[in-house]
């Protein structure tokens, strides 16, 4: 069964800047990847980026740079300033759509150990 993994990391240089990495573990070819925060898209989440392998990448603030890492994984850097910047417990979700198999999604947030507020 295909699976999606999500990894969230806070940049050490900019404490309110995040990197989200997502990947698809399956045999299908990816048609679209949607990255959202605050929950899944359609369930209260807000779209940060949409990546299409042929038609390009669309991104919305505070997303700074979305890109394909491989044919089945992507990364997204979030700007760390302003009212719309994420906090340590923000949930990020990635949805991979593969035709004609369907869609798979997963969500993740910053591991508690990487919260700078908890470090000594």
């Amino acid at each position: 069964t295909p699976e999606v993994w999500v990894q969230v990391r806070m940049e050490a240089t900019e404490l309110s800047s995040f990197t989200i990495r997502c990947g698809f573990l399956g045999s299908g070819s990816i048609s679209l990847v949607t990255v959202s925060w605050g929950g899944p898209n359609g369930a209260g989440g807000t779209t940060l980026a949409v990546l299409h392998p042929e038609r390009g990448i669309r991104q919305w603030a505070p997303a700074r740079q979305a890109r394909w890492e491989t044919q089945s994984s992507i990364s997204l850097i979030l700007e760390g300033s302003g009212a719309s910047s994420p906090c340590a417990n923000t949930t990020f979700c990635c949805k991979f759509a593969s035709f004609p198999e369907g869609s798979w999604e997963a969500c993740g947030s910053l591991p508690p150990s990487s919260d700078p507020g908890l470090s000594a």
Epitope: S31, N41, G42, H52, P100, G102
Partner: antibody, heavy 120, light 107 residues
Framework: DVQLVESGGGLVKLGGSLKLSCVAS????????MSWIRQTPEKRLELVAA????????YYLDTVKGRFTISRDIAKNTLHLQMSSLKSEDTALYYC?????????????WGQGTSVTVSS | SIVMTQTPKFLLVSAGDRVTITCKAS??????VAWYQQKPGQSPKLLMY???NRFTGVPDRFTGSGYGTDFTFTINTVQAEDLAVYFC?????????FGGGTKLEIK
Amino acid sequence: DVQLVESGGGLVKLGGSLKLSCVASGFTFSSYHMSWIRQTPEKRLELVAAINSNDINTYYLDTVKGRFTISRDIAKNTLHLQMSSLKSEDTALYYCARHEDYYGFAMDYWGQGTSVTVSS
Amino acid sequence: SIVMTQTPKFLLVSAGDRVTITCKASQSVSNDVAWYQQKPGQSPKLLMYYVSNRFTGVPDRFTGSGYGTDFTFTINTVQAEDLAVYFCQQAYRSPWTFGGGTKLEIK
């Protein structure tokens, strides 16, 4: 303007064969996933066969597997459905449709349909 | 495969009425639900995608909502031209499956 025009339907004997065609215009045919959907006499809609834009990944309804083959001719902007060993339950109106990645694979354009009647 | 149970099968309404059609999925389909309109003698036409997004040219009296397993399609202020059969469809997992349809008739 996006247009899909089906042809090839008709009256065929039980166990016979038929090849449906769908000529596409108004868009880059090779960039879109395509499918054949049928509407039964009871007006139920069923996705019969689908093909990825890469022309590799395909889907078939369980009841047509091994009997139907979906293919496309990029040079002629044409989608095909080769149907063999036809059964009475294959009697339906057959539509070809385009899937839009950005719309969650919804079928944004449909042809006018071509009728297939399997008689004993 | 995912079963889409659509209710009601028939609706008889007057012009100006508000109409609600529901679709229930046998398992979660996220927000990958589309709604189609099929007028007599015509092929289905896309109305809504991703549950609540209207396709090009679709009037704003058509709205959709829901997530997961329960979805609602509403026509606010029904007009005579809305006489049609309406279908929901999930595209979350292969095979894509349709609801049984709702036939809307105008008094």
